[in-house]
């Protein structure tokens, strides 16, 4: 499950920039746009961030280049560079236009067949909970075990360094096989099994990964938007986990929504299970003190805690994980 290289993707932003740099007009327009978006490091109020005419002109010049449709991949090398390029060529999205739009990540889904040797689990007691079983499957897999230990170490201790913990969490969810990562986090527990639920809730080391002082959700989002990676992951989540109807239909596919959800873990917008007795997830933030933005704040909160697409996607994956162990694996 090696890291993907840029070349594997139809139109990665790093490749598109190389092409652009070979064309003097494209290169000049791109460089000019770079200066237009450099103010991103300090988010501005919308009215102050209106783009100047020359910045809009530079953006227009790139309309016909391959940069305009470029994308990045969650598992690519130099992902940060790729995302920087993406946000440079999409200045309107960078400068306050946060309507749900196109995810910066490419839209192809390559669902790999389930690859796990479940027979190794016979060393566990047959009645062990499934979160324990999935944790064991990770332990028995060298790469998963190594990555999990890395974030375990970074996220442990009384005085853990949160930024290092988050970086290692991101590394785990980017580099571990998807089946291991999803199995570990989205393991099903019996409703009465609080121990299992607690294990699941502690998967992402919330005592270190989540903020010690609960921030306002809108402040959290603003903080996220100031960082290209977090902004990208949030837009990916908004794109793929948008519910189309009350049945819980996702705007794209459940698998893409789950991938986007897992992509938020290790960012400022890290979600988690809120209790050991159910599968409700939420951001670690509050809408208290939102003033006249209370509705907007609650909508952000609900996009995690009461999102029928996400709820359905998590439930379906947990059903799948339960079925894996209900089959007879002796053969």
């Amino acid at each position: 499950n090696s890291l993907a290289t840029e070349n594997r993707f139809v139109n990665s932003c790093t490749q598109a920039r190389k092409k652009c740099e070979a064309n003097p007009a494209c290169k000049a327009a791109y460089q000019h746009l770079g200066s237009c978006t450099s103010s991103l490091s300090r988010p501005l109020p919308l009215e102050e961030s209106a783009m100047s005419a020359d910045c809009l002109e530079a953006a227009e010049q790139l309309r016909n280049s391959s940069l305009i449709d470029c994308r990045c991949h969650r598992r690519m090398k130099h992902q940060a560079t790729c995302l920087d390029i993406y946000w440079t060529v999409h200045p309107a999205r960078s400068l306050g236009d946060y309507e749900l739009d196109v995810s910066p990540y490419e839209d192809t889904v390559t669902s790999k067949p389930w690859k796990m040797n479940l027979s190794k689990l016979n060393m566990l007691k047959p009645d062990s909970d499934l979160c324990l079983k999935f944790a064991m499957l990770c332990t028995l897999h060298d790469k998963c075990d190594r990555l999990r230990k890395a974030y375990g170490e970074a996220c442990s201790g009384i005085r853990c360094q949160r930024h290092l913990c988050l970086a290692q969490l991101r590394s785990f969810f980017e580099k571990a096989a998807e089946s291991h990562a999803q199995g570990l986090l989205l393991c099903p527990c019996a409703p009465e099994d609080a121990g299992c639920g607690e294990r699941r809730r502690n998967t992402i080391a919330p005592s270190c990964a989540l903020p010690s002082v609960t921030p306002n959700c809108l402040d959290l989002r603003s903080f996220c938007r100031a960082d290209p990676l977090c902004r990208s992951r949030l837009m990916d989540f908004q794109t793929h986990c948008h519910p189309m109807d009350i049945l819980g239909t996702c705007a794209t596919e459940q698998s893409r929504c789950l991938r986007a959800y897992l992509g938020l873990i290790g960012t400022a917008m890290t979600p988690n299970f809120i209790s050991k007795v159910n599968t409700t997830v939420a951001l670690s933030c509050t809408c208290r003190g939102s003033g006249n933005l209370q509705d907007e704040c609650e909508q952000l909160e609900r996009s995690f805690s009461q999102n029928p697409c996400l709820v359905e996607a998590i439930a379906a994956k947990m059903r799948f994980h339960r079925q894996l162990f209900s089959q007879d694996w002796a053969d």
């Epitope: 519910p243 189309m244 009350i246 996702c250 705007a251």
Partner: antibody
Framework: QVQLVESGGGLVQPGGSLRLSCAAS????????MHWVRQAPGKGLEWVSV????????YYADSVKGRFTISRDNSKNTLYLQMNSLRAEDTAVYYC????????WGQGTLVTVSS | DIVLTQSPATLSLSPGERATLSCRAS???????LAWYQQKPGQAPRLLIY???NRATGVPARFSGSGSGTDFTLTISSLEPEDFATYYC?????????FGQGTKVEIK
């Protein structure tokens, strides 16, 4: 390529039955909620029915409830609409649709209920 | 049932003009579940906007949606010749899902 193809339409007498099929190709059919929508000649769109990914949940418009049954066979990538006790007002072009961000609609199949 | 009422029934405009179409619900609709479609004669509908304000895949930027609660709007900033068609709103917030009766945008 990604497409939906309806079949099974035709002329039927009032009180009769018809079964519409919608064959899906080019995408993972079982990953999507599916709808039937109809349009009477010269009229607007009317939502008919919806079925969840696995077929466990189905819902209907009041005008067809108790007479129409939506179902799916994910192994065959096919959506169905069983229409019983047909009435003249059921005459329409019937579309099957995948209503998501990248939507897909079939070309429609005409059902005519007339004596 | 949630009844959606679209207005006007017909809109006569010239290419390049701005079109504003209204969709009013008989009761509050969660904006996540409000969609707009375009349909041309002899063709199947095409999703334009979902979640009240989000453009579907491949939809040009001149189409935008807005609104919440019971009042929703589809705006076409500058009409192109290919935009003359019938537009429908749909709610998927309560069963049965329902469509509005449509607004026909015709060439003046």
């Amino acid at each position: 390529q990604v497409q939906l193809v309806e079949s099974g339409g035709g002329l039927v007498q009032p009180g009769g039955s018809l079964r519409l099929s919608c064959a899906a190709s080019g995408f993972t059919f079982s990953n999507y909620t599916m709808h039937w929508v109809r349009q009477a000649p010269g009229k607007g769109l009317e939502w008919v029915s919806v079925i969840s990914y696995d077929g466990s949940s189905t819902y209907y418009a009041d005008s067809v409830k108790g007479r129409f049954t939506i179902s799916r066979d994910n192994s065959k990538n096919t959506l169905y609409l069983q229409m019983n006790s047909l009435r003249a007002e059921d005459t329409a072009v019937y579309y099957c649709a995948r209503i998501v961000r990248m939507d897909i609609w079939g070309q429609g199949t005409l059902v005519t209920v007339s004596s | 049932d949630i009844v959606l009422t679209q207005s006007p029934a017909t809109l006569s405009l010239s290419p390049g003009e701005r079109a504003t179409l209204s969709c009013r619900a008989s009761q509050s609709v969660n904006s996540h579940y409000l969609a707009w479609y375009q349909q041309k004669p002899g063709q199947a509908p095409r999703l334009l906007i979902y979640g009240a304000s989000n453009r579907a895949t491949g939809v040009p930027a001149r189409f935008s949606g807005s609104g919440s609660g019971t009042d929703f709007t589809l705006t076409i900033s500058s009409l192109e010749p290919e935009d003359f068609a019938t537009y429908y709103c749909q709610q998927m917030d309560g069963f049965p899902f329902t469509f509005g009766q449509g607004t026909k945008v015709e060439i003046k």
